[in-house]
């Protein structure tokens, strides 16, 4: 599996999408896990509803949500209030029995919030008709890792 990079801004939300063959993975619950080290296990963060038919319902674990469009074949993970410690390698998984097939490997990168270093005078505020939520855009920039790029720092 190639690794896809998703970049988000600290303090904001990041949406990660994992496309899959909806027939190949029909009836299977999905999960989002965090890779512990280059060859370590993938620790489950959140999984879709226990009843596959209700996979479209958003499930949360802390600041991470998961929802599955089982007809369209897209698993969506939302990382709310992104923090530097959220950066790392993750996997979208398809579950069957106690087995898990990898749908996509994801490298989450957290960018510093550019607003953190500005004077209050430079801050942009929403107008009367705009809510603060409207201005709180979800950033989701993705790319595939280039050949030779390593998602983990090399270990000695």
């Amino acid at each position: 599996h190639n690794t896809t990079v998703f970049q988000g801004v600290a303090g904001q939300s990041l949406q990660v999408s994992c496309p899959y063959d909806s027939m190949k993975h029909w009836g299977r619950r999905k999960a989002w896990c965090r890779q512990l080290g280059e060859k370590g296990p993938c620790q489950r963060v959140v999984s879709t509803h226990n009843l596959w038919l209700l996979s479209f319902l958003r499930r949360w674990n802390g600041s991470t949500a998961i929802t599955d469009d089982t007809l369209g074949g897209t698993l969506t993970i939302t990382l709310r209030n992104l923090q530097p410690h959220d950066a790392g390698l993750y996997q979208c998984q398809s579950l069957h029995g106690s087995e898990a097939d990898t749908l996509r490997k994801v490298l989450v990168e957290v960018l510093a919030d550019p607003l953190d270093h500005r004077d209050a005078g430079d801050l942009w505020f929403p107008g009367e008709s705009e809510s603060f939520e409207d201005a709180h855009v979800e950033h989701s920039i993705s790319r595939s890792l280039l050949e030779g790029e390593i998602p983990f720092p090399p270990t000695s």
């Epitope: 027939m23 190949k24 029995g97």
Partner: antibody
């Protein structure tokens, strides 16, 4: 009506190659995994491996990895099991089976089976 | 690999009898277990999946129970067509594995 129809019985000599087939009908062949299961004379069932004809994703049992090749041709709704060099110990009945995922528990079981292909390897 | 052990290996019974076959997994498999019936010269037929769910078209005299490592298949009142060999199969992990089979014979 869902059907899996397997090719006929084969008698081969050790060292010969062989490819047996399993043709699916009555359902979307590319949307279900197909497994191969061996049953040696008077013995139990052994899972050999599985293929998803939609993209030819294949998994093998460690016991059969490197011993057989599982493939599929989705254009003719057919899965195959092949040997490059048969041994006498390959003598058995071989079944193909459709694997269905039951959403109740997100796991998969074999809901339709072919009639079996008897392979006899003898010098 | 997960080992599946069935007992007894064979059982003799009469029409109308209640028969129980057990299957034990070498490690916990939750409820990821199926039961199949096979008659001589025929392909196996799915009876029960997810340990206790009856496959469509299977008579209600067949029932399954258990979770973890211990499972049972019960036929409440044997019919002549039930004399066959029964296999359990785990669907927990690869490679999928079957029990060695239980042959149900007419007494």
């Amino acid at each position: 009506e869902v059907q899996l129809v397997q090719s006929g019985a084969e008698v081969k000599k050790p060292g010969e190659s062989l490819k047996i087939s399993c043709k699916g009908s009555g359902y979307s062949f590319t949307s279900y995994w197909i497994a191969w299961v061996r049953q040696m004379p008077g013995k139990g069932l052994e899972w050999m491996g599985i293929i998803y004809p939609g993209d030819s994703d294949t998994r093998y049992s460690p016991s059969f990895q490197g011993q057989v090749t599982i493939s599929a041709d989705k254009s003719i709704s057919t899965a195959y099991l092949q040997w490059s060099s048969l041994k006498a110990s390959d003598t058995a009945m071989y079944f193909c089976a459709r694997q269905r995922t039951f959403y109740y528990d997100s796991s998969d079981y074999f809901d339709y089976w072919g009639q079996g292909t008897l392979v006899t390897v003898s010098s | 690999d997960i080992q599946m052990t069935q007992s007894p290996s064979s059982v003799s019974a009469s029409v109308g009898d209640r028969v129980t076959i057990t299957c034990r997994a070498s490690q916990g498999i939750s409820s990821w277990l199926a039961w199949y019936q096979q008659k001589p010269g025929k392909a196996p037929k799915l009876l029960i999946y997810a340990a206790s769910t009856l496959q469509n078209g299977v008579p209600s005299r067949f029932s399954g129970s258990g979770s973890g490592t211990d499972f049972t298949l019960t036929i409440s009142s044997l019919q002549p067509e039930d004399f066959a060999t029964y296999f359990c199969q785990q669907a927990d992990s690869f490679p999928r594995t079957f029990g060695q089979g239980t042959k149900l014979e007419i007494k």
